[in-house]
Amino acid sequence: TQNKALPENVKYGIVLDAGSSHTSLYIYKWPAEKENDTGVVHQVEECRVKGPGISKFVQKVNEIGIYLTDCMERAREVIPRSQHQETPVYLGATAGMRLLRMESEELADRVLDVVERSLSNYPFDFQGARIITGQEEGAYGWITINYLLGRFKTPGGSETFGALDLGGASTQVTFVPQNQTIESPDNALQFRLYGKDYNVYTHSFLCYGKDQALWQKLAKDIQVASNEILRDPCFHPGYKKVVNVSDLYKTPCTKRFEMTLPFQQFEIQGIGNYQQCHQSILELFNTSYCPYSQCAFNGIFLPPLQGDFGAFSAFYFVMKFLNLTSEKVSQEKVTEMMKKFCAQPWEEIKTSYAGVKEKYLSEYCFSGTYILSLLLQGYHFTADSWEHIHFIGKIQGSDAGWTLGYMLNLTNMIPAEQPLSTPLSHSTYV
């Protein structure tokens, strides 16, 4: 009997990231008696839900239950039955749902209502589904990576990492500026974490995720096309795709480029030219107006960049596919590789990457070029500061992203003071 293992005193939590292009379910685990320590929570499972993002279910809300089934059943298997009832489940929807809400609160509510009803059917402690703000998305991403990197731990207050997050519909930049006043109150966050104060800058650029940026670029470029053929430098030579004008103008992101066109469809014909693609993308960033000492683009305040940055989500996935995540690869080298990649004929690309879905494969030239344009011209990284960008997918087995930070906050696992001190009221938490 002496050798019998004691039941481990652990807790679990589930967060669903309802993004614009897909939903992912994350399961986290931590030792119950250490929940106020930094770095003890870790991810034990990621389940990617098959299908698009929840905002695409507007016309088929009855399918949402089935859509979520596989991953919720997976959670049932992974988490011991005895823990089900005390395992919290949170769903956070991001920019795809912000865009749907912008078009219609009713439709966004309807989708979330059905999601809530579906998730309530499971034996877990469902805590609700909501659309998180862009500011929350940025802040929780920053908390996640610094928690996992142990940057809140050290008494000397080693520098925190900045967070760069790229999704399908938005992108976030979050960091602690160096002795710089955050000139725009909308971009300022104050945290007290583990006994230390942090003045954090964050901004979420809605419509500047990689998918919505592509829709914007297409809507901009078709304005000046002489006919229903769009010769596009952001797609490989020989690539062809028909686009419905109605699909192009479905999103609020293309509203400023909307016009009456003499055709219902147009054909993208790839010409694969990185430089021209880059130039076209730059036209999406309005840098002519800045009411502050310094801006990113579109009149949004951005303090001087400071310290190291973790670039995750699509920043990582795209650069990983392009084999450009190594810290040894300079910005000049990345640009050089992108030039070569975009110039490769479509037939050749399809052969080289036979296992990759054509829809995704066709967009890597645009996405890679967009990432470079966003980081360099949008956020003002330079060839020198490029080495401070670390493309990261996971940190010690946990995905970099907003979900862990969100759960840590909602479960009150990030204390304002060092855990040694007396427990404080909930009001002191983030």
């Epitope: 507007v58 016309q59 809300v61 912000r98 809400r101 912008m102 078009e103 219609s104 609160e105 009713e106 439709l107 966004a108 509510d109 309807r110 703000t133 862009g134 500011q135 909308d186 809605l206 419509c207 609020p252 992101c253 293309t254 509203k255 400023r256 480029f257 909307e258």
Partner: antibody, heavy 116, light 111 residues
């Protein structure tokens, strides 16, 4: 708490233009559209159009197209409506309202009087 | 354009009784399983105040005595029991398609 604060009353001459403002607070300004509504004689409500603060794109009621211009300044979280070539028919209260399809929050209104 | 015909144009109801206002659309205002029909209350010198959204959902802080119903083209707003504070103008609105339109209004008074 969400608030929409509109500019004060305007007395303008026929043929002139008027530009009114609507300052938003209590929410992310670029996450919601801003609509403009005209109310004449305390009874008839007419939707003028809306602007997407995110990018400045706008959609109008055909009746007001070409005569109304909608703009925003995102740094000051303010939406503007300019109406040109005013006639006595334009004497009315003008409201801004936040929403996609649900006008849950309204400004207090700007009263415009067109008189020689 | 979708035309909304509101009736009656004016209505006097005794305190504690039921007030019913009707709104008929020239075509269906339903889409994707949602009725894009809204009801507003407006008091003199004030902006309209959202009472009901999506035909039957109560707006934030709206008392339970305000009830909306209907779908497709026929909608109604019921107020029961009528209170003195309910004296106001009431408007229906559709946002199914541009241009968004309002009904002509109903003036509700105490009998």
């Amino acid at each position: 708490e969400v608030q929409l604060q509109q500019s004060g009353p305007e007395l303008v001459k026929p043929g002139a233009s008027v530009k009114m403002s609507c300052k938003a607070s209590g929410y992310t300004f670029t996450d919601y559209n801003m609509h403009w509504v005209k109310q004449s004689h305390g009874r008839t409500l007419e939707w003028i159009g809306y602007i997407v603060p995110l990018n400045g794109g706008s959609t109008f009621n055909q009746k007001f197209k070409g005569r109304a211009t909608l703009t925003v300044n995102t740094s000051s979280r303010t939406a503007y409506m300019e109406l040109r070539s005013l006639t006595s028919e334009d004497s009315a209260a003008y409201y801004c309202a936040r929403g996609g399809t649900r006008f849950a929050y309204w400004g207090q209104g700007t009263l415009v009087t067109v008189s020689a | 354009d979708i035309v909304l015909t509101q009736s009656p144009a004016s209505l006097a109801v005794s305190l504690g009784q039921r007030a019913t206002i009707s709104c008929r659309a020239s075509e269906s205002v339903d889409n994707f399983g949602v009725s894009f029909m809204y009801w507003f209350q407006q008091k003199p010198g004030q902006p309209p105040n959202l009472l009901i959204y999506g035909a039957s959902n109560q707006g934030s802080g709206v008392p339970a005595r305000f009830r909306g119903s209907g779908s497709g083209t026929d909608f109604s707003l019921n107020i029961h029991p009528m209170e003195a504070d309910d004296t106001a103008m009431y408007f229906c609105q559709q946002t199914k398609e541009v241009p968004y339109t309002f009904g002509g209004g109903t003036k509700l008074e105490i009998k």
